[in-house]
Amino acid sequence: GILNLNKMVKQVTGKMPILSYWPYGCHCGLGGRGQPKDATDWCCQTHDCCYDHLKTQGCSIYKDYYRYNFSQGNIHCSDKGSWCEQQLCACDKEVAFCLKRNLDTYQKRLRFYWRPHCRGQTPGC
């Protein structure tokens, strides 16, 4: 769920998601359109695709709560719970580490980026 994602991103990146990523660029935060603005934005676009896939599989992506462990900088998704819970954790883990990998190219100007400026082809999943 969204609480899992926020906590995980904060633990992995050290940034408060609500201040740094939701929203950011054209794809971080709710919704998404156009060409991603940078590598961080690409992380979110890929994450949107991951969620879209789970939605087609019938998963409640915003409601499902999963268990995971954060230890020594790594995320271990628990193998407990339902198929959806496990897959959701995998999606969130991937975006958290993607955002961390791209901290060096994070652009403050893309924080609260005006979505009408998001043009171009929205990448397919």
């Epitope: 599989q57 019938g58 998963c59 407990k80 339902s82 198929w83 959806c84």
Partner: antibody, heavy 120, light 106 residues
Framework: QVTLKESGPGILQSSQTLSLTCSFS??????????VSWIRQPSGKGLEWLAH???????RYNPSLKSRLSISKDTSRNQVFLKITSVDTVDTATYYC????????????WGQGTTLTVSS | QIVLTQSPSIMSASPGEKVTISCSAS?????MYWYQQKPGSSPKPWIY???NLASGVPARFSGSGSGTSYSLTISSMEAEDAATYYC?????????FGSGTKLEIK
């Protein structure tokens, strides 16, 4: 080889508390990934999952019965327990314990079941 | 929770006849699991991850499906196949079972 066996009171009066025991062998609940569920089946009817306990003592309950259920384990004695409070005639059923490994999403070994009759 | 609806609820088949039992999910699931239960016995795992036969299950059984529609098929009915079959999902919490299909031999 994996075996599970349930035991219980057989007959209870309405409003009493049901205590069930699942004794198992062939695996350990201290092994990561292992878990045991309780599942019930009223006579001539379908199966209803009740609760699950994991190797690390994490627990899950059926939301529709959560307030009445309590699952626990004794790892050293290879036993899992289920308590159901305030039983009623609708709780009359055969109660099974079954094993599930977390990486799989089904119950691979089942006990023979123990029958409960609740009289009003 | 996901509701699994099995059809038919009861059916009979002659030896050698092809049998198909259906399981419909109220929302999409990734995999379906099937159990066989005979009177006085506990359910036995029969098919896992939609199409894989559990150990000891005869090759005349098969499973298929995706999304909300799944089925168990017996290519040629035999007397020992008379039983009740249940589908089950743990795609999302809580795990749920179908109401069962009782298969009788003619």
């Amino acid at each position: 080889q994996v075996t599970l066996k349930e035991s219980g009171p057989g007959i209870l009066q309405s409003s009493q508390t049901l205590s069930l025991t699942c004794s198992f062998s062939g695996f350990s609940l201290s092994t990561s990934g292992m878990g045991v569920s309780w599942i019930r089946q009223p006579s001539g009817k379908g199966l209803e999952w009740l609760a699950h306990i994991y190797w690390d003592d994490d627990k899950r309950y059926n939301p529709s019965l959560k307030s009445r259920l309590s699952i626990s384990k004794d790892t050293s004695r290879n036993q899992v327990f289920l308590k159901i409070t305030s039983v009623d005639t609708v709780d009359t059923a055969t109660y099974y314990c079954a094993r599930r490994e977390s990486k799989y999403f089904y119950f691979d070994y089942w006990g023979q079941g123990t029958t409960l009759t609740v009289s009003s | 929770q996901i509701v699994l609806t099995q059809s038919p609820s009861i059916m009979s088949a002659s030896p050698g006849e092809k049998v198909t039992i259906s399981c419909s999910a109220s929302s999409s699931v990734s995999y379906m699991y099937w159990y066989q239960q005979k009177p006085g016995s506990s359910p036995k795992p029969w098919i896992y991850r939609t199409s894989n036969l559990a150990s000891g299950v005869p090759a005349r059984f098969s499973g298929s499906g995706s999304g909300t529609s799944y089925s168990l098929t017996i290519s040629s009915m035999e007397a020992e196949d008379a039983a009740t079959y249940y589908c089950q999902q743990y795609h999302s919490y809580p795990p749920t079972f179908g109401s069962g299909t009782k298969l009788e031999i003619k």
